[in-house]
């Protein structure tokens, strides 16, 4: 099966690359307009040049294109803890990322809040904290892991989870509970 | 069919407390990220809180961190919102809501429930 083309694509795909038809012409290939530009108008005839503009602040085109206006320059989220790794350029869009000690979490595939790495205290890193991933701990005897903090045992309810991990614990208690009744 | 209802709304002091809850059917509630929006009389709508799919990470819009705290119980498909130290400025409708997967925003939300905070 042969993948359904958009118009746009359609058009592109009759002229060599880096260059397009053009909209009024299907018999004329224009030259796309280097990033960093837009197209101001099409080239008047084959072999004429494209008249590009360089785009404005505060927008931008990352590659060769036929835009009629360049793409306005993303802005980091502070509300999510991001910060401006690099700012934007007439080529380039805001590249945000996060503090040292930080992680991404995507709430969606654009959309990324930072958080702080877990320092496993009272756990050993088993992970190390990557870009988009918390560090993994593993924790010490007496400890159990909820949301990727280790938690003392004596905080272990017997309808959590924690009950396996915690049932050394779990059963003295217990035993001095029931040691004490008598 | 997606449905939320929200509950625990109503007419509170100032620095007082209230705990909304969000009754959610008619899809997977484990495998969405949830949340909290409001809606201040005359004003646009206000993202809260956000919540992930197993509770592990949140988001608070700056006015309410450190006062509310979302939660969630996907045994019982419930969401909730714990409001404490409340301002006359949290007035507004609170709408529980489902976050979208292919976009930066909610795609379904309740039908709201009013959160007065006036002496």
């Known amino acids: 099966l042969v993948p359904h083309l958009g118009d746009r694509e359609k058009r592109d795909s009759v002229c060599p690359q880096g260059k397009y038809i053009h909209p009024q012409n299907n018999s004329i290939c224009c030259t796309k307009c280097h990033k960093g530009t837009y197209l101001y108008n099409d080239c008047p005839g084959p072999g004429q040049d494209t008249d590009c503009r360089e785009c404005e602040s505060g927008s931008f085109t990352a590659s060769e294109n036929h835009l009629r206006h360049c793409l306005s320059c993303s802005k980091c989220r502070k509300e999510m803890g991001q910060v401006e790794i690099s700012s934007c350029t007439v080529d380039r869009d805001t590249v945000c990322g996060c503090r040292k000690n930080q992680y991404r979490h995507y709430w969606s595939e654009n959309l990324f809040q930072c958080f702080n790495c877990s320092l496993c205290l009272n756990g050993t890193v088993h992970l190390s904290c990557q870009e988009k991933q918390n560090t993994v701990c593993t924790c010490h005897a007496g400890f159990f892991l909820r949301e990727n903090e280790c938690v003392s045992c004596s905080n272990c309810k017997k309808s959590l989870e924690c009950t396996k991990l915690c049932l050394p614990q779990i059963e003295n208690v217990k035993g001095t509970e029931d040691s004490g009744t008598t | 069919e997606v449905q939320l209802l929200e509950s625990g709304g109503g007419l509170v002091q100032p620095g007082g407390s209230l705990r909304l809850s969000c009754a959610a059917s008619g899809f997977t509630f484990s495998d969405y990220t949830m949340g909290w929006v409001r809606q201040a009389p005359g004003k646009g709508l206000e993202w809260v809180s956000l919540?992930?799919?197993?509770?592990?990470?949140?988001y608070y819009a700056d006015s309410v961190k450190g006062r509310f705290t979302i939660s969630r119980d996907n045994s019982k498909n419930t969401l909730y919102l714990q409001m404490n130290s409340l301002r006359a400025e949290d007035t507004a409708v609170y709408y529980c809501a489902k976050w979208g997967l292919n976009v930066e925003d909610f795609d379904y939300w309740g039908q709201g429930t009013l959160v007065t905070v006036s002496s």
């Open positions: 919540i992930d799919r197993p509770g592990n990470h949140t």
